[in-house]
């Protein structure tokens, strides 16, 4: 189980407590109710970061 305040997930993904694994934030615009999408809001996906180096 994932410890609070830590994230093993790579950029552009977020931890899902419902699935016990990292999930791609790219799915969140299509289905924002997913539990991991809250974590995506805190850090934009990697491809957005490339626009603002």
């Amino acid at each position: 189980e994932q410890a609070p305040g830590t994230s093993p997930c790579s950029s552009g993904s977020s931890w899902s407590a419902d699935l016990d694994k990292c999930m791609d934030c790219a799915s969140c615009p299509a289905r924002p109710h997913s539990d991991f999408c809250l974590g995506c809001a805190a850090a934009p996906p990697a491809h957005f970061r490339l626009l603002w180096p």
């Epitope: 189980e1 999930m23 289905r31 997913s34 991991f36």
Partner: antibody, heavy 120, light 108 residues
């Protein structure tokens, strides 16, 4: 072959308790989320509860929240549903089902169901 | 919760007929829509997931289409073993997933 086998159903009085079990075989149980779905006699399907692969995250339908508890024992490949304060409207066939490995997307395997009858 | 409404509630058809069942969501659910078949006294069986993807082992006469709020399950040529009740299920609004009320396909 994937198999899910429910047990523990039966006749219980209103206010009583039952514990359902679902024994899984034919696949590696621990990576999969699991669900309970029920079907009242002659009616449609109703999602009851969800549990994450580790058991650390659970969700319930409003109709059972506070009365039912879902759990799992990955070492025994078994899913459970503890049902307390049972009501007549809980009478149904209870199915366990395996969730997809993405996110709540589908139920790809189901057990044969166990009948719970709540009546005085 | 998102409401799923199937139509018709029941239908009569003959072997070889093309059968279409529709499912409407009370709000957009993108393509997060699945179809199940249930025969009397048996557990439901997954037919179609993500609106149009055929589950492994399901005959190709079954197909699904749609997105947003309107979805369709089509059986291109009804077979004797297809007489059953069919349910749609949305998995957009998690964890509050919901099923349609079912469509019973009977022999004419």
């Amino acid at each position: 072959e994937v198999q899910l086998l429910e047990s523990g159903g039966g006749l219980v009085q209103p206010g009583g308790s039952l514990r359902l079990s679902c024994a899984a075989s034919g696949f590696t149980f621990s990576p999969y989320p699991m669900m309970w779905v029920r079907q009242a006699p002659g009616k449609g399907l109703e999602w009851v509860s969800y549990i994450s692969p580790s058991g650390g995250s659970t969700h319930y339908a409003d109709s059972v929240k506070g009365r039912f508890t879902i759990s799992r024992d990955n070492s025994k490949n078994t899913l459970y549903l503890q049902m307390n304060s049972l009501r007549a409207e809980d009478t149904a066939v209870y199915y366990c089902a395996r969730g997809g490995d993405t996110y709540f997307d589908y139920f790809d395997y189901w057990g044969q169901g166990t009948l719970v009858t709540v009546s005085s | 919760d998102i409401q799923m409404t199937q139509s018709p509630s029941s239908l009569s058809a003959s072997v070889g007929d093309r059968v279409t069942i529709t499912c409407r969501a009370s709000q957009s659910i993108s393509s997060y829509l699945n179809w199940y078949q249930q025969k009397p006294g048996k557990a439901p069986k997954l037919l179609i997931y993500a609106a149009s993807s055929l589950q492994s082992g399901v005959p190709s006469r079954f197909s699904g289409s749609g997105s947003g709020t309107d979805f369709t399950l089509t059986i291109s040529s009804l077979q004797p073993e297809d007489f059953a009740t069919y349910y749609c299920q949305q998995s957009y609004s998690t964890p509050g997933i919901t099923f349609g009320q079912g469509t019973k396909v009977e022999i004419k």
